[in-house]
């Protein structure tokens, strides 16, 4: 057919520490020389299709898919995956072709399948298929476990695609708050993967394997507990599974549960209802709201209403990436030696991250503690007070996150002094930085008290041992105060220390300490 | 863009009486449910009370009895109708509709 446009679809693999990628999903810096992917037009099928190579990409890489089109005039253009539309921004080349993009970053499971490219152009309108799977390599993953509804009855099932096979167990709670700490008395563990007792007040599943351990709430809404101030939120990325689940507690069976998303009900089929009577005959209600996978139009406000209790909502946000938000600016603190000081890291991130504390290239445990607003927190405080450079680095499935942290410690300077044959030297460590005074010995002096401004060399901040800053002094050698004995001082607002020093001909040097 | 503004606070003697209302714009006020909350000097904010599309009406333990909510869905208002008023109730009120919130109307009781 002569109207076709010359179409050339390409595989862009980028190096894992490629700091290109991920900066404009439009442009892409090409890391690796694109590997041609055909692009055939596929027979017998309705409409223009044109059919890639199947990709195959390890787990974790970062690639793109480019379709190239040599066709006269603009082209406009939309890619689907798993029944959503993406993003799509079309740009010229140096040849004049049109450039179309997806970027994958770290490929996971979840972004594996189908990926549909509709190009429409001024001459006709074409379709471009490419199917992207994850290479079956023996890289060991531990995967966030997710939850789907039993066949035929009311049971949810765990799942991890994890390798090696991981060890599914559900971790339940029926108390509230702090009491619900993985260790406490009033936690229950069931190692299987079928959970029948859906009414507890605190769901988890977890999975793990040698990678370690992962774990998924059941997100909740108990219409018991008073309205929080802050609307609950939950994230979720384009083609995970949805679950919500509304519980309510009252004296007896007369209420319903429904659930709205933004003020329309739910269709049949992506909710289930159970109920129960507890111990003291009240009757228990839970009301289940899921999707098997999720699109961008499930976003919004889910309401959970109940003719009895206060309604409640949780607002969903679909997003076609993870991501980690928090301010990644520098800071400074100046603390006392005992003053009880934590470093701390305010962050949302979606799914959750992974993260480490740094100091000295000696890297500490991360704890992160979830906030009321959907927030969560990460501290460091075991810094024994130790001056420098600390780095909190943050990362997930498809982000990156680094923040550096000063530490300065208010002391006194110390003094430290070395000379050869032409100079001597002091150094300081003190902070705030010290100031710095040379002092001749003398006969007439006996106290030191004669100051010597000439031949004096100051430097701030010489060298930085892992963010701590050093101050020196140094003071040429002249035949003035050769033979004598000098001092030199380092003075901050918190005092002053000397050292000093023989300055006689070449050889060892007697440094005297005086505080 | 979702508004919501509060209005009908002010200074009222112990057992005396308030009426807060609550206009709301920007939002299909008739198929939402709308809390009112408080938030008194150095303390968390609070849920008070929740009326619903079909005008159910909820209240916190501490208001049972003394405040009433109600609608107008023809005016886009709720209101809030305080009476026996305690010095305890003396706080900063706001309305919310989902993630929305007002800016308050400041109630002092005094005794």
């Known amino acids: 057919n002569q109207d076709l446009p010359v179409i050339k679809c390409v595989l862009i693999n980028h190096k894992n520490n490629d700091s290109s990628v991920g900066k404009s999903s439009s442009y892409p810096m090409v890391s690796e020389s694109p590997e041609d992917l055909g692009c055939a037009l596929r027979p017998q099928s309705s409409g223009t299709v044109y059919e890639a190579a199947a990709v195959e990409v390890d787990v974790s890489a970062s690639i793109t898919l480019q379709v190239l089109v040599d066709a006269p005039g603009n082209i406009s253009c939309l890619w689907v995956f798993k029944h959503s539309s993406l993003n799509c921004q079309p740009h010229f080349d140096l040849q004049n072709r049109g450039v179309v993009s997806m970027v994958i970053l770290k490929m996971t499971e979840t972004q594996a399948g189908e990926y549909l490219l509709f190009i429409q152009s001024e001459a006709t309108n074409y379709t471009i298929l490419f199917t992207v799977s994850i290479r079956n390599t023996l890289l060991y993953t531990l995967r966030r476990p997710y939850f789907r509804k039993m066949e035929n009855q009311d049971a949810l099932v765990c799942i991890s695609e994890s390798v090696p096979e991981p060890i599914v167990e559900w971790v339940l709670c029926d108390s509230q708050g702090e009491s619900c700490k993985e260790e406490s008395p009033a936690v229950v563990k069931k190692e299987e993967k079928v959970l029948h007792e859906l009414f507890g007040t605190d769901i988890r599943c977890c999975a793990r394997n040698e990678l370690g351990r992962e774990c998924t709430r059941l997100f909740t809404i108990d219409l018991n507990q008073t309205p929080q101030t802050t609307l609950p939120q939950l994230f979720l990325k384009v083609g995970e599974p949805l679950w919500i689940r509304c519980k309510a507690v009252h004296v007896n069976h007369g209420f319903g549960l429904t659930w709205e998303l933004e003020n329309k009900a739910l269709e049949e089929g992506n909710y289930f209802e159970m109920s129960t009577y507890s111990t003291n005959r009240t009757m228990i209600r839970i009301l289940f709201a899921f999707v098997s996978s999720v699109a961008r139009n499930d976003t919004g406000y889910y309401t959970c209403s109940s003719s009895k209790h206060p309604s409640q909502s949780a607002l969903v946000t679909i997003v076609e990436k993870g991501f980690i938000n928090a301010t990644n600016s520098s800071e400074d603190y100046e603390i006392d030696q005992y003053e009880e000081f934590c470093f701390s890291v305010r962050f949302k991130a979606y799914p959750q991250i992974r993260c480490t504390w740094t100091f000295s290239r000696k890297s500490f445990p991360c704890e992160q503690k979830g906030l009321d607003n959907g927030y969560s927190i990460s501290k460091f405080c075991n810094h024994k007070h130790q001056p420098g450079e600390y780095i909190f680095h943050a990362e997930n499935d498809d982000a990156q996150f680094t923040k550096m942290f000063t530490l300065n410690i208010r002391r006194k300077p110390q003094v430290l002094a070395e000379a050869s044959a032409s100079q001597a030297s002091c150094f300081s460590d003190g902070y705030p930085l010290p100031s710095w005074t040379w002092k001749k010995c003398s006969d007439k002096s006996p106290n030191c008290t004669e100051e010597i401004t000439e031949g004096v060399w100051n430097r701030k901040a010489n060298r930085k041992v892992f963010g701590q800053w050093v101050s020196s002094s140094t003071l040429n050698m002249s035949e003035a105060i050769k033979g004598f004995l000098v001092k030199c001082c380092a003075y901050n607002s918190l005092g002053t220390s000397c050292e000093t020093i023989l300055l006689n001909s070449p050889g060892p040097f007697p440094f005297i300490q005086d505080n | 863009q979702v508004q919501l503004q509060e209005s009908g606070g002010g200074l009222v003697q112990a057992g005396g009486s308030l009426r807060l209302s609550c206009a709301a714009s920007?939002?299909?006020?008739?198929?939402?449910?709308i809390d009112w909350y408080r938030q008194a000097p150095g303390k968390q904010r609070e849920w008070v009370a929740q009326?619903?599309?079909?005008?159910?009406?909820f209240y916190a333990d501490s208001v049972k009895g003394r405040f009433a909510i109600s609608r107008d869905n023809a005016k886009n208002t709720v209101y809030l109708q305080m009476n026996n008023l305690k010095p305890e109730d003396t706080a900063v009120y706001y309305c919310r509709v989902l993630s929305y919130w007002g800016q308050g109307t400041q109630v002092t009781v005094s005794s």
């Open positions: 009326i619903t599309r079909d005008s159910n009406s």
């Open positions: 920007g939002v299909t006020f008739s198929i939402n449910y």
